[in-house]
């Protein structure tokens, strides 16, 4: 259930206020719905980063537990296919709150196009 | 700056269809942004309709699918909607809307138009 | 029925804190965002997501989330604050928009 997901996020959001996580990651900003599951694995692969880089156990269970949540629904849709999207490593590196923000709007593509 | 222009008829007749477009400017309407109708009866509350994206996906509020739709035209940089069968009922103020990137929010706002709905 | 509750009133003496509410389940997923408005005006956005304020709206505005209650807190109300208040989330769907039912601030 993607709304599950956005709910993770909120938590992590809340979880790093009071933490200062300098990475940047992989993001992708203007996501194409051809390629959407493409770019939910980028995402899904950087949140790693904001669990091993913030050492907190709380953040490390919600991501852990945000990533089975997104899987399970990604798989849901069935082995889709796509084509012509970019790798994790060309997208444009963003600050950890425009990564989230651009994380939910992703979520959101999901939920609204279902 | 993105700015927002609701256009359309003041007066619709009842049982008619009420059709406005919103011309945007200073941004495009092919960005990552969803875009909103909104609407505002006299002396209630915000009202949503529904949203759009520019690739033709649409979400309408359940209460008014059945009357609702949205569309986009891209060359034009608007949206429009159309609601059908009217009633006194739907005489509102009707604004358009971008949505933020992200959490649920409305960044900007046309400055509304008042439909009224009377013979 | 709205499936984010306001309380319709709330006053302020000039120059005192006042925090408006916003109740709903799906506060539990979403953030809620708010809305400033005005007779005769558009609505503006003062609040979004965590606690993030657009361009050229004050600091005496501000955002926080506990539960299933969002809350809007201006400290130091002034005159020009007097407005209608509207908070902004989905719904538990994620799939629809949906709007408090307004909190009419009076500024005493």
């Known amino acids: 259930n993607w709304v599950n997901v956005i709910s993770d996020l909120k938590k992590i959001e809340d979880l790093i206020q009071s933490m200062h996580i300098d990475a940047t990651l992989y993001t992708e900003s203007d996501v194409h719905p051809s390629c959407k599951v493409t770019a939910m694995k980028c995402f899904l692969l950087e949140l790693q980063v904001i669990s091993l880089e913030s050492g907190d156990a709380s953040i490390h269970d919600t991501v852990e537990n945000l990533i089975i949540l997104a899987n399970n629904s990604l798989s849901s849709n069935g082995n889709v296919t796509e084509s012509g999207c970019k790798e994790c490593e060309e997208l444009e590196e963003k600050n950890i709150k425009e990564f989230l923000q651009s994380f939910v709007h992703i979520v959101q593509m999901f939920i609204n196009t279902s | 700056q993105v700015q927002l222009q609701e256009s359309g008829p003041g007066l619709v007749k009842p049982s008619g269809t009420l059709s406005l477009t919103c011309a945007v400017s200073?941004?495009?309407?092919?960005?990552?942004?969803?875009w909103s109708w909104v609407r505002q009866p006299p002396g209630k509350g915000l009202e949503w309709i529904g949203e759009?994206?520019?690739?033709?996906?649409?979400n309408y509020n359940p209460s008014l699918k059945s009357r609702v739709t949205i569309s986009v035209d891209k060359s034009k940089n608007q949206f429009s909607l159309k609601l059908s069968s009217v009633t006194a009922a739907d005489t509102a103020v009707y604004y358009c809307?971008?949505?933020?990137?992200?959490?649920?929010?409305?960044?900007?706002w046309g400055q509304g138009t008042l439909v009224t709905v009377s013979s | 029925s709205s499936e984010l509750t306001q309380d319709p009133a709330a006053s302020v003496a000039l120059g005192q804190t006042v925090r408006i509410t916003c109740q709903g389940d799906?506060?539990?997923?979403?953030?809620a965002s708010w809305y400033q408005q005005k007779p005769g005006q558009a609505p503006i956005l003062v609040i979004y997501?965590?606690?993030n304020r657009p361009s050229g709206i004050p600091d005496r505005f501000s955002g926080s989330s506990s539960g299933n209650t969002a809350s809007l807190t201006i400290t130091g109300a002034q005159a020009e604050d007097e407005a209608d208040y509207y908070c902004?989330?989905?719904?538990?769907?994620?799939?629809?928009?949906?709007f408090g039912g307004g909190t009419k601030l009076t500024v005493l």
């Open positions: 809307a971008r949505e933020g990137i992200g959490w649920p929010s409305f960044d900007y």
């Open positions: 200073g941004g495009s309407i092919s960005s990552s942004n969803w």
């Open positions: 997501g965590k606690n």
């Open positions: 759009i994206y520019h690739y033709g996906y649409t």
């Open positions: 799906t506060l539990r997923s979403y953030y």
């Open positions: 902004n989330s989905r719904d538990s769907s994620g799939k629809n928009l949906v």
